[in-house]
Every structure is written in structure tokens, then in C-alpha cells.
């Protein structure tokens, strides 16, 4: 719900966007993920912090966890144990990478409303989780896994060679986290508990980068991070699996890898538990175009886990690399065998495919000239998927559902028609056996989140509606947008225009373009949002676009795998060829004309200002990529191959942002970056600086001293202060 | 510690109301349903019904026309009243309490109370 | 009303015995299945609840299984304290019902 536009008699009581309002987070949302626990029950944090679970079908709600108790050991976070006699209460949390951290925890009996004494857990934890059933726990500790058969149990230790960056079990690496997981866990209960999965990652042999982190002491210490840049030793991987009844039995039992997988360097890319005795790998090799489904079963006789090759699926681009960002995984049926798993069709669309014996024989379930994107859930008789289907756009998302049980199978789109303007960006989350469900929806206009009958899709009531940012943005000007697109050459590109308040088509604006533009991403969404360039077309009249061009997502294989093996040409080309195209629209004045992006975008940014064009005055570049020789090796090998002669060298070497600084001279160019990054490294900005110094070229820099790759805290609000000043003096715009 | 006790008159006579309280400490109102069942003589178990943390109630359709269970929380009380009794009502009165924790499962009874319907 | 039919209604088992209960219920219950266990003028105690579950402080030896309609309630060695009789419930649904009962003796 976007507030109405008001008649110019009403505009001296409304107010442009402040810088301030941004930075204070003034106009942030709310979304309501219901934390699940059964088919008809969730828990949630009540406003005063007690722990509430609400049975959607009695509409009764039960304090099981009060503030107090939370706040008796300054707890953040909680998790109920699944036979729901325990309670862990997570506090001390210390942020590692993106996703990982540490803790501290406690036991909490709700039987007894009394913490569990003796045999505490030791302290800091690395990763901790119930079982699926009933309240065993394990946990990493010092990069070795442990269990307990109860809370107040002696732990049992399972693995013993963890060692820090060098032997992980049970969590990630650096690379294993950020590139490949996207979790701080590696670690997989069986459906019943019976056996618990996991991961060791062997980093022994990869080089490590090493960074200063200065602190507040006399000498700086150094991080130093197992990070295989493109080319280098990989970590070596290794999947393990113990009966955790009898532990002690016959101990962890590795899972053997596909030969076809095994003959190379290769990736582990997820685990799926099938049932309590069948388990589904993934495995990828590391030129990533060829991915291996292996299905396992555990032998009683032997006590070890056979994955037979008539169970193998393998999953082969031509024309790219495998999967999109990453390559999906399957969603089993109740025959606990046959799987529905989203890949590419032959006309180069990702969608939906029901695998019953071989790849081969895949039955296609959704197809046409979109892409489905996530499966939610299979039931005996529906799946619930989100595509971006409706109406064309692809910067949209809806949930569908397809009814399996009858056939020919039939289609409802349970979200296109609910709340058609305001809601256009859909996601959700689902109890048990899809008995409830709820969707939260992300815009385009104020986002709210419903709670919905699983069988009749009926909504049943509204969970967060973010009345009081409604209540908030009545007297804001905020910009107007528009979500259009670009024919050119055979190609589409989808854009987003943010337009000042009073925007009149036959007055000139500056133009910034916000860009990110990676690989398999997409910037052009159908999603609510005020935040800094919406605060430049508000209050400073600035135009802002964000296009989506070759490489990016959602679109068909044509256009995501157009980029590959060649990083940095058409990504920066789309870029010019738009703002070309908005020129001609004859309300840009093309003498004011910007881009800035961060990191992948960061690096576009470079690249489009270093293009030679004479289109940009300015940019502005925040902890970009400089060199794919400097950048992890599961991503950048992904779309780029490896950096070797015999490979790809040659456009590692022509895609660097250094062989372009001549051409910076003239433009106005800002280059940002923490020095704490431990994900596109300071090096990455070192380089560009020392390149364009070599050159002699004149450029504008600023570091943030012990900040990593989000720039958080206090840094964010120098950062966009600075940005602002830097673009109001590019575009001469008064302060 | 947790703890519920039945109290209220042994004998009723038949065509009264049967009225029975249950009064209850060692545990938040807020977390907890409460159940009343009851068995009579050498019989088996049979439900009530109960009033949900939130004052709602829900009764077994046998006796619903028969039946009202209410609370007053700042007494830690609950109360069952059965109308138009006959001596098939005569019975072991419990009062129970469920909740979530236990997926609405019966976690601790009172001690009882026989209830006679008779002349 | 889902009907909860238990069988036997009585057994007789010696010291040391592994004990079976069976309970079937009318239509799915998933696994919202509970097990009570009452001694002569003694209000019944919760044993097992979700079908599976031990209550806090209840014995290993005893254990309950099963989903959807079939349902197991086992003492892995029988004791003398164990002498009661044993009740399934249903907590998926109101009204709540119990089955019939089934009284456990020593040989």
C-alpha cells in the first residue's frame, strides 16, 4: 500500500525524505515468519519479549518462556526442543562471517522451570541444534562435534582432529559458507534422529590470507583465513555419518563419493535426508557444469551407507555452468525415491521437473517463458512453489499450487489476485504438512504478512500489516517508480526507475544508476523499500535506475550464461546501452550522470566509468571487486573457469579494473572500502588505488578501518553521508 | 510445586446441579488449559471438557447441554457445574491440567473427588 | 467422536516380561496419542504423550510408538510397581476420548 498521492493544495504538509530519516532507519518493516513447531502451532516473540505459541486452530496462546527467564541470561535467542521439554536460550552471540557465529547457551527444563545443571555445555559454541525428534543435541565445539543424548547428559564426543583453520567438522570453512552452503552449519539430523550427517572440510594445504585488524591495542593483530582465491588448493572435503543411539558402535562412516565426481578436484554442495535410512549428496566438480544427485541407503548388515550408481543423477550444462546461483536441490515425494528438483528445460527456462528413475525420463511439471524459482513444499496431494510467472514480469514473485494427487495435475495461483497493487513480491513459509501457511509479501507496496488455511488457501488473519509505517509515510514525498523495460538487440532489459515527487518529463534530472549486476542476481523487484536512493530522488530530485542486463537471473539461460567465462563485458555493456536508452526518454540531463554499486556492482561501476563512453561524470565504487584472481574460487571459477593458460588467463587478465586506469582520468571517481573485509579483500581497492596512482590519475578514496564487506555500525552513516556529498558536488547540487 | 485439588459436596441429589471447584498453584494460568474428567465406579475415563487459557471452553457434545466449566484466575480457580444430574453421573471428579508442552496431553491431575447422585 | 479401541483388557505377565498394549484408533490421529497409567484410588499419571514421548521422570522401560490410527505402548521388563491399569487417549481432537483400559497383573 503505497500512500495516496495528494492534491498539490495538501503538498506544503508534506515533507521530502531526510538523509536522517534513512540512516535512523525511520521507515524500516516488519515481516512475521511464524517459527513453526507443528501443523497448527507457532512460537513467537512477543513485543515484551515472552515466548508465546499460538494453535491457530483452538486461538489459544501460551506464555511457555517468559522475559524474565530470557533476560536471566541475556538471551537473544531461543530454541524448543521437538518433544518441547527443553529450551535452549542462545546469548553472547559474536558474529564471525556472514552467517556464522558464536554463542553462548543454556539448557532450560519447562518441565521444572529450572535451568539444567551439570554437564553444562562448554563455552563458545560454534553451531547447536536439537534433533528432530525428541531432545537429543548436537553441537560443534573447537571445530569438533558432540552429542548428548539429553540436556543433562555427559557429551559424547564424536570427532576428535578439529583443529582452528585447519580441520573443520561440522561447520563450514570460509569458502564452504559464503559460496557454496550459505549456512554457518554442516550438519544434518535424519528425519527421526537416528543418524546425524555431517562435513569435515580439510583446509590443511590452502593459502590463507592475512589481514590487520587494529583495534585499540599497540600492535595490530592479523586475521588469517583459509581462502582459496580462484586457482588455488581447495578444501578437501569428506562426509561422514553416525548412528547416534549407539555412538560408540562402529563410530562415523564416510559416505563414498561418485567416481564420475572423484576423478577431479570436486564440491560438496548439500545433504537432504530422505528418510531415517536414506540420504541424498550432492556433489559438483569444480569446473562447475557438471553436478552428481547420489542416493544413499544404509546398510544394517554392514553398518555402512551404499549409494549405488543406478541412483546417481547427473546434471550437465552446455551452455554454463550447473543450477543458477546455486544448483537446486530436490524436494522427495512420499515414495521416499522419486524427487521434484527445479533445472533447466530445453528451452533454456529453469523450472520444475519430477524425477522419477532417471534424468533422463524427468517429467516436466511447470514450463513457458518464466522461470520457477523456489519449491516450498510437496503433500501427498499439492506442491507449493513461487515463480515469477504472472503477468510477465519478472521482478515479481507468486506462489502457486499444483495439485499432484489428480491428473492432469492443475495450477492455482494462490497470491496473483489477494492484494494485486500492493502486493506483487511473495514469499512463504509453511507448518506440517502444509496445514497453514504464511505469506509474507515484500511490496511493491507497504509489506504485510497473512496467515492462510493450507487446504482452502482461505486467509485466516493478518500477522504484521506495519500499520505504523502506513501511519508514518502519510506526510512523506516519496518518489514514484516504475518497473519498465528495454528491447535492444534481442535482448530485454528490465529496468526500475525512481522519479522525484514532483517528476515532469519536460524538465532535465541528474541520473544515477545503481548497479550490481552479478551473476544470477536481479536488482529490478517488485519490492517496497525507503531507503538511500529513495532519500535522492525525494529530497536531492535525482533520477535513479537500476537495470537488469545480461548475466542476471530469472529470465532464461540465454541471458544468465550469456556472461560466461567473461566476467565484466556485458554486464558494464548493458549498463551504457541503458542509459543511452534513458537519455533518449529526454528528461536526463546526460552532463550529470552517475553509477555507484557495491561489491560485484562496485566492480561494474569501475569498469562502466573506465569504459571510455564520456556517458558518466562520476561513480563511486564500495569494496569492489578489482581482479577475479583475487576472488574466491567456488564463485569466480563458477562463471570464469580457472585462471590457467590453458583456461581462461587471458580474460582474467583483460577483465581487471587496474588495465583500465587511464581511463579514469576523466571522470570523478570514489573508491570505498573496509579494511576488515574478509570477503572481497582490501587488496581488491589497494590495487585499483595503486594503479591509478601509477597512472597518475587523480581519484577520491576512503577506507573504514576494521569494517568488513557491510560496512556496518557508525561506518554505514559515514558512508552515506559521504556518498551524498560526493554526488551533490558531482551533480552541483547545493548542500 | 504443581499442584490441583477438587473440593465440593460428596453427595448431590438427583435433578440437582453437581458444582465442583478446582483450585490450582505451582504453575502460570497463561502456559495451561484445564481439563475436567471423570470415572465412575470400576468404569473407564471420560473427558469433560475444559477452558482454554484464553476463557474459552469446549465440552464433550454427551454432555454439553448439561455442562459449564469457567475460571477465575484471580483466585487460581476453576469451576464445574453439571445440571440435571442422575445417578449415572456419580462419579471420581478429576481436575487436570494440559497445554502445549504436552501436545494437550493430561500432565497432572488432582487427587479427585467423589461425587454420589442420590436420594 | 474418535473411538479408541484398546487391546488386551487385561493380561497377566510375569517379573521381567516385555509387555504390549495395542490401541487403534477410529480414523487418523496422527501421533497426538497418550499413555496413562493408573494405580487402585490413585488419579492416572501421564506416561508417554505425541505417542512417543517419555514425561519427565518416567522410566526407560516404558515406550510408546506409532501414527495415524495404530498405536503400541510397551514395558521392556515388567516390575512389580508396574501392577495399574494403563489408558490410551487421543489428545488430537475434542472431545478427547480414552480407551477402555487394560489392566496389567503379575503372574
Known amino acids: 500500500l503505497r500512500p495516496s498521492r495528494v492534491h498539490n493544495s495538501e503538498e506544503n504538509t508534506m515533507r521530502a525524505l531526510t538523509l536522517k530519516d534513512i540512516l535512523n532507519g525511520t521507515f524500516s518493516y516488519k515481516t512475521f515468519f511464524p517459527n513453526w513447531i507443528s501443523g497448527q502451532e507457532y512460537l513467537h516473540q512477543s513485543a515484551d519479549n515472552n515466548i508465546v505459541l499460538y494453535n491457530i486452530e483452538t486461538g489459544q496462546s501460551y506464555t511457555i518462556l517468559s522475559n524474565r527467564t530470557m533476560k536471566s541470561v541475556n538471551a537473544s535467542n531461543y530454541g524448543l526442543s521437538p518433544d518441547r521439554q527443553f529450551v535452549y536460550l542462545e546469548s553472547d552471540y559474536s558474529k564471525l562471517w556472514r552467517y556464522s557465529y558464536t554463542a553462548t547457551y543454556y539448557i532450560y527444563d519447562l518441565s521444572n522451570g529450572e535451568f539444567v545443571r551439570g554437564n553444562e555445555l562448554p563455552r563458545p559454541i560454534q553451531y547447536l541444534c536439537w534433533s528432530p525428534v525428541g531432545s537429543k543435541l548436537a553441537y560443534v565445539y573447537q571445530n569438533n562435534i558432540y552429542l548428548k543424548q539429553r540436556p543433562g547428559d555427559p557429551p559424547f564426543q564424536i570427532t576428535f582432529n578439529g583443529r582452528e583453520n585447519k580441520i573443520f567438522n561440522g561447520i563450514p570453512d570460509w569458502v564452504y559458507e559464503e559460496e557454496m552452503l550459505a549456512t554457518k552449519y554442516a550438519l544434518w539430523w535424519s528425519p527421526n534422529g537416528k543418524f546425524l550427517a555431517y562435513a569435515e572440510f580439510n583446509d590443511t594445504d590452502i593459502p590463507v590470507i592475512a589481514y590487520s585488524y587494529y583495534g585499540d591495542e599497540q600492535y595490530p593483530r592479523t586475521i588469517n583465513i583459509p581462502y582459496p582465491k580462484a586457482g588455488a588448493k581447495n578444501p578437501v572435503v569428506r562426509i561422514f555419518i553416525i548412528d547416534t543411539t549407539y555412538p560408540a558402535y562402529v563410530g562415523p562412516q564416510e559416505v563414498p563419493v561418485p567416481a564420475m565426481i572423484a576423478s577431479s578436484d570436486y564440491y560438496f554442495s548439500w545433504l537432504t535426508w530422505v528418510t531415517d535410512e536414506r540420504v541424498c549428496l550432492q556433489w559438483l566438480k569444480r569446473v562447475q557444469n557438471v553436478s552428481v544427485l547420489s542416493i544413499c541407503d544404509f546398510r544394517e548388515d554392514w553398518q555402512t551407507w551404499d549409494c549405488p550408481k543406478t541412483q546417481e543423477h547427473i546434471e550437465e550444462s552446455r551452455t554454463g555452468w550447473a543450477g543458477g546461483f546455486f544448483v537446486s536441490t530436490p524436494v522427495f515425494s512420499y515414495d521416499a525415491i522419486s524427487y521434484y528438483k527445479i533445472f533447466s528445460d530445453k528451452d533454456g527456462y529453469k523450472h520444475i521437473h519430477y524425477i522419477k528413475d532417471t534424468v533422463e525420463n524427468a517429467i516436466q511439471i511447470t514450463s513457458g517463458k518464466w522461470e520457477a524459482i523456489n519449491i516450498f513444499r510437496v503433500t501427498q496431494d499439492s506442491l507449493f512453489y513461487s515463480s515469477n510467472e504472472f503477468e510477465e514480469y519478472p521482478g515479481r514473485r507468486n506462489i502457486y499450487r499444483i495439485s499432484i494427487g489428480s491428473y492432469p495435475p492443475s495450477k492455482k495461483c494462490v497470491t496473483c489476485h489477494l492484494r494485486k497493487e500492493r502486493c506483487q513480491y511473495y514469499t512463504a513459509s509453511f507448518s506440517d504438512y502444509a496445514k497453514y501457511y504464511a505469506l509474507v509479501c515484500y511490496g511493491p507496496g507497504i509489506p504485510i504478512s497473512t496467515l492462510h488455511d493450507g487446504r482452502t488457501d482461505q486467509e485466516i488473519k493478518i500477522l504484521e500489516e506495519n500499520k505504523e509505517l502506513e501511519n508514518a509515510l502519510k506526510n512523506i514525498q516519496l518518489p514514484k517508480e516504475e518497473i519498465k523495460k528495454l528491447e535492444v538487440d534481442e535482448i530485454t532489459l528490465w529496468y526500475k526507475m525512481i522519479l522525484p515527487p514532483q517528476f515532469d518529463r519536460s524538465k532535465k534530472y541528474p541520473l544515477l544508476i545503481q548497479v550490481y549486476g552479478g551473476p544470477c542476481s536481479q536488482s529490478v523487484r517488485s519490492v517496497f523499500a525507503v531507503n538511500w536512493i529513495s532519500y535522492l530522488a525525494s529530497k536531492e530530485g535525482m533520477v535513479i535506475a537500476l537495470v537488469d542486463g545480461r548475466g542476471t537471473a530469472f529470465q532464461g539461460d540465454k541471458l544468465l550464461y550469456a556472461v560466461y567465462r567473461k566476467l565484466g563485458v556485458y554486464e558494464v555493456e548493458d549498463q551504457i546501452t541503458a542509459v543511452r536508452k534513458f537519455i533518449e526518454m529526454g528528461f536526463i540531463d546526460e552532463k550529470r550522470i552517475a553509477i555507484w554499486g557495491w561489491s560485484y556492482g562496485g566492480y561494474v561501476s569501475s569498469l562502466a566509468l573506465a569504459s571510455g563512453t564520456g556517458l558518466f561524470k562520476c561513480g563511486i565504487a564500495v569494496a569492489p571487486v578489482s581482479s577475479w584472481e583475487y576472488y574466491a574460487s567456488v564463485y569466480t571459477e563458477r562463471f570464469m573457469g580457472l585462471p590457467t593458460k590453458d583456461d581462461n588467463l587471458e580474460h582474467y587478465k583483460n577483465s581487471t579494473v587496474m588495465a583500465r586506469a587511464e581511463y579514469f582520468r576523466n571522470v570523478d571517481y570514489l573508491l570505498i572500502h573496509g579494511t576488515a573485509d574478509d570477503n572481497v579483500h582490501f587488496q581488491n581497492s589497494a590495487q585499483i588505488a595503486k594503479a591509478l596512482v601509477n597512472a597518475q590519475v587523480d581519484f577520491q578514496a576512503m577506507w573504514y578501518s576494521d569494517q568488513n564487506h557491510g560496512l556496518s555500525g557508525l561506518s554505514t552513516n559515514h558512508l552515506y553521508t559521504h556518498m551524498t556529498h560526493f554526488l551533490k558536488q558531482c551533480f552541483s547540487l547545493s548542500d | 510445586q504443581v499442584q490441583l485439588q477438587e473440593s465440593g459436596p460428596g453427595l448431590v441429589k438427583p435433578s440437582e446441579t453437581l458444582s465442583l471447584t478446582c483450585t490450582v498453584s505451582?504453575?502460570?494460568?497463561?502456559?495451561?488449559?484445564i481439563n475436567w474428567i471423570r470415572q465412575p465406579p470400576g468404569k473407564g475415563l471420560e473427558w469433560i471438557g475444559l477452558?482454554?487459557?484464553?476463557?474459552?471452553?469446549n465440552y464433550n457434545p454427551s454432555l454439553k447441554s448439561r455442562v459449564t466449566i469457567s475460571k477465575d484466575t484471580s483466585k487460581n480457580q476453576f469451576s464445574l457445574k453439571l445440571s440435571s444430574v442422575t445417578a449415572a453421573d456419580t462419579a471420581v471428579y478429576y481436575c487436570?491440567?494440559?497445554?502445549?508442552?504436552?501436545?494437550?496431553?493430561?500432565?497432572?491431575w488432582g487427587q479427585g473427588t467423589l461425587v454420589t447422585v442420590s436420594s | 467422536d474418535i473411538q479408541m479401541t484398546q487391546s488386551p483388557s487385561s493380561l497377566s505377565a510375569s517379573v521381567g516380561d516385555r509387555v504390549t498394549i495395542t490401541c487403534k484408533a477410529s480414523?487418523?490421529?496422527?501421533?497426538?496419542v497418550a499413555w496413562y497409567q493408573q494405580k487402585p484410588g490413585k488419579a492416572p499419571k501421564l506416561l508417554i504423550y505425541?505417542?512417543?514421548y517419555r514425561y519427565t521422570g518416567v522410566p526407560s522401560r516404558f515406550s510408546g510408538s506409532g501414527s495415524g490410527t495404530d498405536f503400541t505402548f510397551t514395558i521392556s521388563s515388567l516390575q512389580p510397581e508396574d501392577i495399574a491399569t494403563y489408558y490410551c487417549?487421543?489428545?488430537?481432537?475434542?472431545?478427547?476420548?480414552f480407551g477402555g483400559g487394560t489392566k496389567v497383573e503379575i503372574k
Open positions: 487436570v491440567r494440559g497445554g502445549p508442552l504436552v501436545w494437550y496431553a493430561l500432565d497432572y
Open positions: 505451582g504453575f502460570s494460568l497463561t502456559n495451561y488449559d
Open positions: 477452558i482454554w487459557t484464553g476463557g474459552g471452553t
Open positions: 480414523q487418523d490421529v496422527s501421533t497426538a
Open positions: 505425541s505417542a512417543s
Open positions: 487417549q487421543q489428545h488430537y481432537s475434542n472431545p478427547r476420548t
